[in-house]
Interface confidence: medium
């Protein structure tokens, strides 16, 4: 599939003060419950070997995993923020649903797989950590996709 402009998010998604605040509050609440400070999910390692033009596709993969396997199973926690942030991130995920890349995505899949395995290995505390890094997810989506 060709690289296309569908790997784009409107900057306006990231300029809504209310939902930005709720996203960061959710991350803050979860990070207070995260006692594993040695592990970072969204950091330099996640982007290693991935060109700048492919980083939005990478973040799409991370966003979908976070929604499917972290936020929805944990959707009872960290209210009222979770209730508002999940539909917002779902909207971003929908906007990126036609985002594909051409060529080799081996590095991307390897890096995403490592993130998933880390979360799974840590169990529930891995999910809490992922929620605690929603601010990083938010900023990385903005940097990579706008």
């Amino acid at each position: 599939l060709p690289v296309n402009t569908r790997c784009k998010l409107e900057v306006s998604n990231f300029q809504q003060p209310y939902i930005v605040n709720r996203t960061f509050m959710l991350a803050k609440e979860a990070s207070l419950a995260d006692n594993n400070t040695d592990v970072r999910l969204i950091g330099e390692k996640l982007f290693r070997g991935v060109s700048a033009k492919d980083q939005c596709y990478l973040m799409k993969q991370v966003l979908n995993f976070t929604l499917e396997d972290v936020l929805l199973p944990q959707s009872d926690r960290f209210q009222p923020y979770m209730q508002e942030v999940v539909p917002f991130l779902t909207k971003l995920s929908n906007q990126l649903s036609s985002c594909h890349i051409s060529g080799d995505d081996q590095n991307i899949q390897k890096n995403v797989r490592r993130l998933k395995e880390t979360v799974k290995k840590l169990g529930e505390s891995g999910e809490i950590k992922a929620i605690g890094e929603l601010d990083l997810l938010f900023m990385s989506l903005r940097n990579a996709c706008v």
Epitope: N64, E68, D69, L72, P73, S75, D76, T90, N94
Partner: antibody, heavy 124, light 108 residues
């Protein structure tokens, strides 16, 4: 056997109220989100409302917001739909369905179990 | 709201033949698409989820395909018990599930 059994439907006048119940058995009710879906006579399916596993968050379709309220009592394995200010267009069979949840093996993500439905008729 | 459109509204096929039902989404739903079967007076029953995965108890003659906005449910060789109404449903826009209007599969 995994089962959902709705009750509480009936005939009600416009502006009236009803409370639907859905009794769950055969699975760990408290670990699953639950939804209500309705079907007007001879029509398609319409999502009405969803509640997360412990009831911490609820979501409603715009068409019912402020009038229909989903709730649950995990100690009784029961899901509820409180219906107020009912309109003729709310006439439908209301189904409860097992939704998002986590098992030991996987995250279940679809409406995989449905009740038999209860008919709500709003008419003067 | 994501609008789901099914075609045809009514499909007449003979037992033993192949049936192909279509579902189109107004915007991409990735692979978050399910198919339900409903018989008169009964609740819907989940047949296919995530576009192509068969739910527990779904016979192998049912298969799903597609991605993005265009999806297909195929029944390879129709059995008498397969004549029913079929609905597609997206869960991409969680929890605002939307369903297609249904395709009635009837005996030719």
């Amino acid at each position: 056997e995994v089962q959902l059994l709705e009750s509480g439907g009936g005939l009600v006048q416009p502006g009236g109220s009803l409370r639907l119940s859905c009794a769950a058995s055969g699975f760990t009710f408290s670990t699953y989100a639950m939804s209500w879906v309705r079907q007007a006579p001879g029509k398609g399916l319409e999502w009405v409302s969803t509640i997360t596993s412990s009831g911490g968050a609820t979501y409603h379709a715009d068409s019912v917001k402020g009038r229909l309220t989903i709730s649950r009592d995990n100690s009784k394995n029961t899901l509820y739909l409180e219906m107020n200010s009912l309109r003729v267009e709310d006439t439908a069979v209301y189904y409860c369905a097992k939704d998002w949840g986590r098992t030991v093996y996987a995250v279940i993500k679809d409406l995989d179990i449905w009740g038999q439905g209860t008919l709500v008729t709003v008419s003067s | 709201e994501i609008v789901m459109t099914q075609s045809p509204a009514i499909l007449s096929v003979s037992p033993g033949e192949r049936a192909t039902l279509s579902c189109r989404a107004s915007q991409s739903v990735s692979n978050y698409l399910a198919w339900f079967q409903q018989k008169p007076g009964q609740a819907p029953r989940l047949l296919i989820y995530d576009t192509s995965k068969r739910a527990t108890g779904t016979p192998a003659r049912f298969s799903g395909s597609g991605s993005g906005t265009d999806f297909t449910l195929t029944i390879s060789s129709l059995e008498p018990e397969d004549f029913a109404v079929y609905f597609c449903q997206q869960r991409s826009d969680w929890p605002q599930y939307t369903f297609g209007q249904g395709t009635k599969l009837e005996i030719k």
